[in-house]
Structures are given as C-alpha cells and as structure tokens.
C-alpha cells in the first residue's frame, strides 16, 4: 500500500480516506451545476464556469488555482444567416430544406443560446450537386466506392453516416476523393438501440436531434494558427491559408429526419452489400445523384459559419507535493460543452470536481501528497483539444522534465455496463491492483471486486482472468501529453456492451438531449457508475502522486512491443514476395523488442532490492521509470505528423479515435500494393523499420544501470 | 527484381484460337489486379482486359468481347488470355502487365500474335 | 470512355535540347496521368505517374506538369538514349485504360 512521510494520517488509511470521502451526492450535485445552460467555449457562460471553479477549488483547499487563458482560432454559426440543406428542382427553387435548429428537449425550452448543429469550422459556401452517399466516409468506404464500384465522388457533394471514425476523417477523406461537399447524419443503425424510446423517453436520439462536432485535421497542432507554440498574447498567427487541419469544402450535420428525405430519392448504383445499409426506409443507393422522376433534382448547401479568434480559459489548480515537488501528476477534462454537456464533458468535470474536493479535504487535515498534484478544467476541447494543447505548449519544458503522469477526465460514462480503460502498458498493473481494491457497482457483482466484474464482462482477448485494457488513439486532452510530450497517460470511464450495443458512442451525443435528466433518469439515477469512476481516477492519481516508487512496470511494455511487433510482420507479410524483392527484414525491431524485454526485466529485479531510504538512488529509479515514456519520442515526430512523436502509438491516420501501434511502419505499409512506385514505397517501410527499431533499443537504454 | 513473361504467341488463321500464359515474380501477384494490353505493328498501345485480385471483376475492351477470356491462378502465380475468333486486326505483340488502380505498372517482354490466312 | 489526345505526333531534337510534349484528355482527369517512355521492340516503361511524380531510378531531366484535362512531358537537355516512343495514359476513370497515340522522339 502507499505510504507518504509527509502526512499526519496513518499511512495506510492515506487511499481509504481519500477513497472514502468521495460521495456519489456531491458528484449528482455538481453534474446537475455545470449543466442548467450551455457552456460553449469562447462564450461568456464558460468564462463564468471557469471562474466559479477556480473559486471553488480554492475553496475546497488546494494551494493556488490559476486562470490560462489563450486567444485560439473557434467557429461559429452565423446568428442571423443560418445553415441548412436545401433540395432545389431544375428552377433552382428550394423544394426541400433540412431544420434550421433541434427541437429542445421539455424543461429547456426558454434557455438562450443553444448553438444550432453545424460542423465548427466548415468554410463557408453554398455547393449544389448531385449526391453520393459513401456509407461511412471511412477509407475503405471510399475505395469500394472509387476501385471496385468505379463510382467518382469528384464534383459531387457526398452524404456521410456518423460513426465508426472520427468525423474529420471522413472530411479528409471526401475531400481526397474531390467532393465539393459533406452532409453527415445520424442513421438510426448507428444511433438509436433497439428496444428504447427516444429522448425524453428513453436514451435514444430523436430523429430531429444533430450531433455538433469539429472536423479538423489537426493531428495534434492545438490552435490552428500557432501550431507548436502557444497562443498567447504575442503570438505570431498564420493567415487562415496557412492554418492547420481547416477543412476545404462545406460540411453540415443532420438527423435523420432530413436525412430520410435525402436519401429516400437517392438512384444510381445499389449499395454494394449489407454493411452499407442503415434503418432508415430508403433504398441506400449510392447514386450519383436522385432517381429518375427526381434526376433534374440538386443538393445545395448553405453554409455561413466564421471562424473567430476568441479567449479561451483554462483552470488550473496546484496541490504542492511535499517531498518531490518537482514531479507532477495531471488530472484533467475539460469543461467546454457543445449545448448542456449532460455527459460529455460535465459528467467528468463533476467527477474532477469531487476528487479535488476529497484532496482538498485531506490537505486541510494536514496530508500533502508526496509528488504535486495539478488539477485542470480545460476549454475548448470540442474545438480540437485546444485548450490542453495550447497550456502544454506553453509549459512544455516543464511538463517534458517534471511529468510523471497524466489521467483523463472527460465524460465518465458513455454507458453502464462496465469499465473501459485506455492507458499506456506502464499503468496496466497500477488500473489491475487499483481495480482489485474497489467494489463492483454492477448489478450481480454485489460484495466482488471492480476487476473481477471488468474481467467478466470485458476480457483481455489475449490474457485469461485478465481485463482488456486499450491502447490510447486521441479526440481527447490527453493527446498532448502523451503522443507529443511522452508523458505516460490513462483513462478510465464506465461504457456499454459493446457486443450487444453496436452503435457509435452514445446515441445523444453532442446533441441539445444531452442533459442532465439524461444521465439521472437513465443512466445513472444512483450516480454509483460516476462514483466508481471517481474512484478509479482519484486513485490513480493519488497512488501516482503518492507511492515512494512510482507505480509503473516496464516489463508490460516488454509483453505489448513483442505483441505489436509480431502483428506489424504479419502485416508486411501479406506481402511475400516484396518483402524479398527489397530485402525488407524486421531482425533488428525483434532484436530490439528483445534488449527491450531482457533490460526491463533486470531492471524489475533492481527495483525490488534497491535501498528505498536513499533518496538519491530512489529518485534516479523513479526518473528512469519517469523517463521511459519520453524515451518513445521522437523528435522529428511521424511522417507529416510533426506533434504525433510517439514512435508506439499514435492515433490512426484513418480514424484519430482509434490508437495505432508502430504507426510509422503501419502507414507505411497500409496499401501498398497501390503504390506506384513501390521501390520507394519500401525503401520508407525499410526506414519506418529502422527508426522503431533504434527507439525501442534507445528506449531500453535508458533502464540500464546507469553506471 | 520484377519478372513478368509472357509465352504463348505465335501464328494462327483467321477464326482461330490462341491461349496466352504470363508469369510473375518479384511481388505478389494475388495482391494486383492484371492488364492484358496489345500493340499493333507500328501502332499505338490498346488495353485488351483487366482481371481483379480474386478474379470477381472481369473487363474486356468493345473489340475483343465476347471472344477473349481473361483468368489467374494465384497460387501459379499466372495470368492467362484465351483468344477465339481471332481476326487480322489482332495481330499484335501482347503485354501483360501489373495495373496499380489503373497504372499500367510492370509489363513483360510481350509475346507476338499472327493472325493471317 | 476519356480519350486521351497527344500532340505532336512525332517531333526531332538534338542532344542537348529541351522538348515538351502535351496530353489532352476528353474531361478532367484532376492528376490522374501517367507517362511511358518506350523503345523499339520493348516494352513500355513508366516514368511519370499522377502527372508529376518521378518514379524512382528515372532521371530528374524529366518533369511532367499539368491538372484536370492538359497536361505536359518535358525533357530538359536531351540525353541519346531519350529518343523513344512517348505515350500518356490516364488512369482517372478505369477500365477502361486509354492511351495516347504516342508521340515519337526522333533524332535530328
């Protein structure tokens, strides 16, 4: 158990009490604040948010609690020239136009400034076209549609269901294949589970409810116009040519209300199989364009959104360690809101909220934890990690030197079935002993442990008895700790059987339904899912902040590596006969997986005999454990990804949601055989190869006795 | 490197039949979609027929359809034109060639086809 | 189906010289164009694909340019062994493949 010389608490009751005064009422209570309006970032709202947090962290006890604040590129719908989609006949008369704003949900119908659906940060215009529906937009979306269906999305403006991935994928990837627009929507497949009724019945969408969402390309820049650098109040901005990840051509949301009428007139081409069909009551044609009586038909878009340099506020709060002050432990979510946030962000915020109060608490009895703690409430992460990218950017020589670790915090359910755990390998024994010492809030668990109902309901696929744990991709604040700094990085929230749920998320997420009568009527009405996660991320953070030797195993990074390298072979040997041809071998990344192993292992055994009361040998300990994640980095960063360094992980180039391992060699891989010049394109597998190979040699370097 | 031989020309008469062979090494051919494309004497390159990884999409040009049928064998690392009905006018030397999403890629040497009476 | 139309048919240069040749097609290709150089009784070679990218192992004397439906081949300073057959393919819309009728690099 932890233990801390810096306290007047009895060691081992240090986890229990901080445990033990986490309540599931404050979190009810804290959840239904932050959500009776919007608190959209840039807005006067989230600025008054920002402050009552401060203010209530100083409150609850912690050392200092300071406002950041950074002027970054936002998008907003034009108040008075509102967006929509318009069916327009062989006249040009609009016979057809999508809602202008969703209908708002009972008890909220008087609240002001609810921003309508719109994709932040779609250029302005008003494309008209035919229209090709191109399933989900992801890239095999796009090469059955181009290579197998020979159907040409060029000139055309594509219809686009939300879902699988990330929904600025599905823009780049519309606008690699020449779309001149994008209309997403959510189909009923995706966003409404059998079985229940509708918001404000059930936890459905309703077919007049929009998911909002940013469709950057960012991949990791933080504010468009000052990638790599914070910005602040002397920055130098790019001219918006010159911006980051904008998107090229129009893009809006919509239900499926409108999409029904959309893509009911749709002909051309048939879908090519059963995966491109939804629920909805239309052919799924793929098109070009609308049926025969409907042929003279066109789409037009209306699009007159603006993009505005706007203040954004971070809060970040500082509980000072009292032995290793200098060694920092993160926990932060951010607080910005499409509409009410009832899940996503609040439900972590209120869950952050709760944790600082029990920290403070412990504080004000006289305890420090052993290693500073900071707390933050950043803005603008629906506008593309913003907020977290910029302070990062900002306290980037101090976090690369001093951070030991970074939890995450956002939303903490997207259901209640059972935990999901995201983190680096160097975590996965700290979430295992954590997840043994705290109770199971499901339902037939009564009395077993949180691991072993995690366990039940969500096996490792490759470990018997053990919880499966994923890597971490992006699309949220952790993104710049981990995949640009190399700071090791967590997350924990409860989620919903995916076997059983097969829709994307939840089904109301980002739209005006996400409420907080959502989450109290449906589910979580006890907030036990909220206070189990409150206990999984406080207690990470409190063992990371407080254990004498940090609580990190570098021989579960030895098991993934040889994991991740087998499986990158396996893919390169699809590919036989080329792999020959080049002489593309991976003995040196397996040679290196190896040291790698042979290193941690020998390193494992130190730490077990090593003298703990030399503060001297313990600190180097901890630094190389520190040090380990870092050691991952490169510093010229991946292939045309200068911010994703991180030679393991990085999120896919195909969906930002998802993590990809060695995505240097993936990328350079991924269709290859439609390289035309295939002697370069090796050459850069080769290279790929060769850079993984030095980091993970470099890598286990830096466990080897120092001298 | 890249090996792509074609055999199987040579002279035959009008409304005759001819069975061309193309081998490859050096990549993996079940991964490419194949081309047969011909040159006439002294002419411009016409592309004959295409065939898809697992042979499910097959396409002729107008001028031979009906009476050229294009197949593989993956695991012989083979492509193959079965020519019937031949006429004078597709008297040509025969390329087969790796197609990349339609860049005629790597081409053999060519094997010659005669059709004259 | 896209035709591809090359102009000149045939042209003669010196060693030394620079040429261009050009490549219309019927609609827009965006980038889609490919360059094959070929010799008598060989088959034809790729030297340039989507229009301007090199293809490893060919010389930088060669450079194409061009989008949507006009495109050009340039060979700045002309080696003896450029004289050749020169064809444009486009590989937009496929199949099917369609070539240009060649444009044939004579000696002067």
């Known amino acids: 158990k932890s233990s801390n010389e810096a306290t007047n608490i009895t060691p081992k009751h240090n986890m229990k009490a901080f445990l033990d005064e986490l309540k599931a009422e404050n979190i009810k209570k804290f959840l239904y604040n932050f959500t009776q309006i919007p608190h959209l970032a840039g807005t006067e709202q989230n600025f008054q948010l920002a402050k009552q947090i401060q203010s209530q962290w100083k409150e609850f006890g912690l050392d200092s609690v300071e406002l950041a604040h950074y002027d970054v590129l936002l998008s907003y719908p034009n108040k008075t020239h509102p967006n929509y989609i318009s069916i327009i006949n062989e006249d040009g008369n609009e016979i057809f136009n999508t809602s202008l704003f969703e209908p708002p949900p009972p008890g909220y119908e008087n609240v002001s400034d609810i921003v309508p659906p719109f994709s932040a940060f779609s250029p302005q215009g008003m494309p008209e076209g035919d229209l090709v529906y191109v399933n989900y937009a992801r890239t095999e979306d796009f090469f059955k549609l181009e290579r197998d269906m020979k159907i040409n999305c060029s000139g055309k403006i594509v219809i686009a269901r939300y879902g699988k991935v990330f929904r600025g994928n599905k823009v780049k990837n519309a606008q690699l294949a020449g779309a001149k627009g994008v209309i997403l929507y959510s189909d009923p497949a995706d966003y409404f589970a059998p079985g229940v009724k509708s918001y404000p019945d059930g936890w459905n969408l309703p077919g007049g409810g929009v998911q909002r969402g940013n469709i950057l390309n960012l991949n990791g820049a933080g504010d468009p116009l000052t990638p790599g650098y914070p910005a602040n109040e002397y920055a130098y901005r790019r001219g918006i040519a010159e911006a980051v990840g904008l998107p090229s051509i129009p893009v809006h949301p919509i239900g499926y209300y409108d999409a029904q009428k959309l893509l009911e007139k749709m002909g051309g081409s048939a879908p090519p199989d059963s995966s491109w069909r939804g629920s909805l009551k239309v052919p799924y044609n793929v098109g070009p364009g609308f049926t025969g009586n409907f042929s003279t038909q066109k789409v037009k878009m209306h699009i007159h959104s603006t993009n505005e340099v706007t203040r954004i506020y971070n809060v970040i709060g500082t509980l000072r360690g009292a032995v290793e002050p200098d060694r920092y432990v993160i926990l932060g979510g951010h607080r910005d809101s499409w509409v009410f946030g009832g899940i996503d962000p609040q439900s972590g915020a209120a869950v952050v909220h709760e944790i600082v109060r029990s920290f403070g608490t412990l504080k004000k009895e006289g305890w420090r934890p052993r290693r500073t703690i900071l707390f933050a409430s950043w803005d603008a992460e629906e506008f593309g990690l913003l907020g977290s990218t910029e302070w990062a950017e900002e306290n980037s020589r101090l976090l690369q030197e001093r951070g030991v670790a970074y939890i995450n915090a956002d939303s903490s359910i997207e259901g209640n079935y059972t935990l999901r755990v995201d983190c680096t390998p160097l975590m996965y024994s700290l979430v295992h002993n954590l997840t043994k010492e705290l109770k199971s809030p499901d339902e037939g668990f009564e009395g077993k442990s949180l691991y072993e109902s995690w366990t039940k309901k969500s096996p490792s696929p490759e470990f018997s008895g053990m919880p499966r744990i994923s890597k971490l991709g992006s699309g949220n604040d952790f993104e710049v700790f981990f995949q640009r700094l190399g700071i090791a990085s967590g997350r924990a929230r409860y989620t919903k059987n995916w076997e059983t749920n097969k829709f994307s998320g939840y089904p109301l997420y980002h739209s005006v339904y996400e409420t907080y009568e959502l989450v109290e009527k449906f589910y979580d009405p006890m907030f036990k899912y909220h206070l189990t996660v409150a206990q999984v991320r406080g207690g990470m953070v409190f063992e990371l902040a407080n254990s004498i030797v940090l609580p990190f195993d570098c021989r579960d990074y030895a098991v993934v590596l040889r994991k991740y390298a087998d499986k990158i072979y396996s893919i390169s040997m699809k590919h036989p006969q080329e792999m020959k041809t080049y002489s593309v071998s991976f003995d040196s990344l397996f040679s290196a997986v190896k040291n790698f192993t042979e290193i941690a292992s020998k390193f494992s055994e130190r730490l077990q005999d090593f003298d703990k009361s030399n503060p001297i040998v313990l600190r180097m300990m901890n630094d190389q454990l520190m040090f380990l994640e870092r050691a991952f980095i490169d510093p010229l960063g991946l292939p045309d990804r200068p911010f994703y360094r991180h030679v393991i992980y990085a999120p896919s180039s195909h969906n930002k949601y998802a993590g990809e391992s060695f995505p240097g060699i993936y990328d350079a891989l991924f269709d290859i055989e439609s390289k035309v010049d295939p002697s370069k394109a090796w050459g850069e597998v080769k290279r790929q190869i060769y850079v993984a190979a030095f980091t993970v040699q470099a890598a286990a370097e830096t466990l080897s006795e120092v001298a | 490197e890249f090996q792509v031989v074609e055999s199987g020309g040579g002279l035959v008469k009008p409304g005759g039949s001819l069975r061309l062979s193309c081998v490859v090494s050096?990549?993996?051919?079940?991964?490419?979609?194949m081309n047969w494309v011909r040159q006439a004497p002294a002419k411009g390159l016409e592309w004959v027929s295409s065939?898809?990884?697992?042979?499910?999409?097959?396409y002729y040009a107008d001028s031979v359809k009906g009476r050229f049928t294009i197949s593989r064998d993956n695991a012989k690392n083979s492509l193959y034109l079965q020519m019937n009905s031949l006429r004078v006018e597709d008297t040509a030397v025969y390329y087969c060639?790796?197609?990349?999403?339609?860049?005629?890629?790597?081409w053999g040497q060519g094997t010659l086809v005669t059709v004259s009476s | 189906d896209i035709q591809m139309t090359q102009s000149p048919s045939s042209l003669s240069a010196s060693v030394g010289d620079s040429v261009t040749i050009t490549c219309r097609a019927s609609?827009?290709?965006?980038?889609?164009l490919n360059w094959y150089q070929q010799k008598p009784g060989k088959a034809p070679k790729l030297l340039i694909y989507?229009?301007?990218s090199l293809l490893s192992g060919v010389p930088s004397r060669f450079s194409g340019s061009g989008s949507g439906t006009d495109f050009t081949l340039t060979i700045s300073g002309l080696h003896p062994e450029d004289f050749a057959t020169y064809f444009c393919?486009?590989?937009?819309?496929?199949?099917?493949?369609?070539f240009g009728q060649g444009t044939r690099l004579d000696i002067k």
């Open positions: 393919q486009q590989s937009f819309s496929t199949p099917p493949i369609t």
């Open positions: 050096g990549f993996t051919f079940s991964n490419y979609n």
């Open positions: 060639a790796r197609d990349i999403i339609g860049t005629t890629r790597d």
């Open positions: 065939i898809s990884t697992g042979s499910s999409d097959i």
């Open positions: 989507t229009a301007s």
């Open positions: 609609q827009s290709i965006n980038n889609y």
